[in-house]
Interface confidence: medium
């Protein structure tokens, strides 16, 4: 049924979903507050623009009665309950900020007749690709996939003078929603790293991924794997590993990398950890002072929802259009804007691009190195370091076949 | 399952130091974080410090610049240097552990996040 949207008069409403069932396990208290300080910031500017406007947001709780899995598993119904409470109470805003979870965002959006945008905080997985009005605000596994393509086949730097074609992926069912997401992407036989890729084969068992270690009839040393480190300890431990392997750990959403009193521990040594680049004011900001390195990301994305927001509404009243047509629904895309710690650039999709990481551990310091950025919005690998101190021979990363020479 | 023995405490006065060792059962590297936490009398049990994977330290405001947990992997044990130490650093200290993120990647801030514990060794800073 059709519900009318408190937007319009001067006085524009944000509904923002608050799931018991989310990609991440932060209290909902922090998730308010990183909506308030967006609030704040938003009024601020719409009244620099001489925008004399009401904004406000709606939290809009779930029961919690059944969907009560805490993780993402039993997220589908308690999103569409959520619409359906919301339908209800005939208070819908100009924009619904909500579901992190794939799973509950690909219903909604499947469900309902949308004729206006959706913010989320998550829903990583391919299947919330190329949704007309669903804009997402941490890295989908598509923007994964094809760091790893082009990383893969990129042969012409001084620490990587092989094109890569083979890997393994690792992903035992236990993973964060995040790496749930990023490694079914990988593993999907239509998926662009599948097609792209020549051999790939998922490990799923731990004794799997450590025969492969030292295996001489491995068809590839490339492993894939997603997680925190500890997740990689729990597999290898102190196992010895073959010298032209290279274990690939997928961690976008940690900044632990990056602090000063970080010291990579040994078992390191033959991973590369591809995370996101930290913004700049973050780390020491008062907004984050209370969260883990793990956590400001997905509390940072509500914040910039509702940054991306105050955006596009301040650009459609200055414009004088209106707020609740299709337009509007559609125009959260393709565009920059001004986030909590810097820009924040949306692609054609409505998907945030972002400078992925790749770091290494230095032999030398013990330290993580940046290695190379990759620019999600170009599709495009910066080498950072040239003469990585690197455990592997000559400080060049293995080809991906053993015994196979230059290509 | 992850056994956690605490030793290193006693009595000491004011401005004076300890060094708490906290045996697991388990590899520290193979946690997801472990911390410390105190206990005065009367009071809630309180975070002071932890370590998350990567190595990522963080402390209470209180202990800032004065504590330090660090780690070593072979010997198995965690540990909380405490110099300075003040009669307001009374209490029972425990150490705890949280071996997997889980599919929500725990933060490891509060006592919830945290499964295993380990006995306590009490602490008492006279002035």
């Known amino acids: 049924s059709q519900v009318s949207q408190n937007c319009h008069n001067g006085s524009y409403e944000i509904s923002v979903l608050m799931m018991g069932n989310s990609a991440f396990a932060e209290p909902l208290k922090n998730l308010e507050d990183a909506v308030n300080e967006g609030l704040e910031i938003v009024r601020g500017r719409l009244q620099n623009a001489g925008l004399n406007v009401t904004v406000n947001a709606t939290f809009m709780y779930s029961d919690g009665l059944i969907h009560n899995s805490g993780d993402c598993r039993s997220s589908t119904c308690e999103g569409l309950d959520l619409l359906r409470k919301i339908s209800n109470a005939q208070r819908m805003g100009c924009v619904l900020i909500g579901p992190s979870c794939t799973y509950s965002t690909f219903q909604m959006y499947l469900d309902t007749e949308l004729s206006y945008p959706m913010i989320s905080a998550g829903s990583f997985g391919l299947s919330c690709d190329y949704k007309e009005t669903l804009t997402r605000l941490m890295s989908p596994a598509r923007k994964l996939m094809y760091f790893l393509v082009n990383f893969w086949k990129t042969n012409d730097l001084p620490f990587k003078t092989y094109s890569w074609s083979t890997s393994y992926v690792y992903k035992n069912g236990t993973e964060t929603e995040d790496c749930f997401w990023y490694l079914n992407a990988l593993e999907a036989s239509v998926s662009y790293f599948s097609h792209e890729l020549g051999f790939k084969v998922v490990l799923r068992q731990d004794k799997e991924f450590q025969d492969i270690l030292m295996d001489h009839n491995r068809k590839s040393n490339v492993i894939i794997m997603c997680g925190g480190p500890e997740f990689l300890y729990k597999l290898k431990g102190d196992r010895a590993v073959a010298e032209d392997i290279v274990i690939i750990l997928v961690d976008l959403f940690n900044d632990q990398y990056f602090e000063d009193n970080v010291t990579a521990p040994d078992y390191m040594k033959n991973v590369l950890v591809l995370t996101l680049s930290p913004g700049n004011s973050l780390l020491n900001s008062s907004f984050s002072r209370n969260l883990s390195p793990t956590k400001r990301d997905f509390a940072l994305a509500y914040l910039n929802g509702i940054l991306l927001f105050g955006h596009m509404l301040k650009i459609f009243l200055e414009n004088g259009e209106n707020i609740t047509t299709p337009k509007f629904a559609h125009a959260f895309r393709n565009l920059t804007f001004e986030g909590y710690d810097g820009p924040v650039t949306l692609d054609d999709w409505g998907d945030v691009d972002s400078t992925m990481v790749l770091l290494y551990t230095s032999v030398d310091t013990k330290k993580y190195k940046v290695l190379l950025t990759y620019d999600t919005h170009v599709n495009k690998t910066y080498p950072v370091d040239m003469s990585p101190t690197f455990t592997w021979k000559n400080s060049k990363l293995p080809n991906d076949i053993t015994g196979r020479g230059p290509q | 399952q992850v056994h956690l023995v605490e030793s290193g405490g006693g009595s000491v006065q004011s401005g004076g130091s300890l060094r708490l060792s906290c045996a697991t059962s388990?590899?520290?590297?193979?946690?997801?974080?472990m911390g410390w936490f105190r206990q005065a009398p009367g009071k809630a049990r309180e975070r002071v410090a932890s370590?998350?994977?990567?190595?990522?330290?963080t402390y209470a405001d209180s202990v800032k610049g004065r504590f330090t947990i660090s780690r070593d992997n072979a010997e198995k044990t965690l540990y909380l240097q405490m110099n300075s130490l003040k009669p307001e650093d009374t209490g029972t200290y425990y150490c705890?552990?949280?071996?997997?993120?889980?599919?929500?990647?725990?933060?490891?801030?509060?006592?919830?996040?945290?499964?295993?514990w380990g006995q306590g060794t009490q602490v008492t800073v006279s002035s």
């Open positions: 705890a552990a949280r071996p997997d993120a889980g599919r929500w990647r725990s933060a490891c801030t509060t006592e919830l996040d945290f499964g295993y």
């Open positions: 388990a590899s520290p590297y193979s946690m997801h974080c």
């Open positions: 370590i998350l994977n990567a190595g990522s330290t």
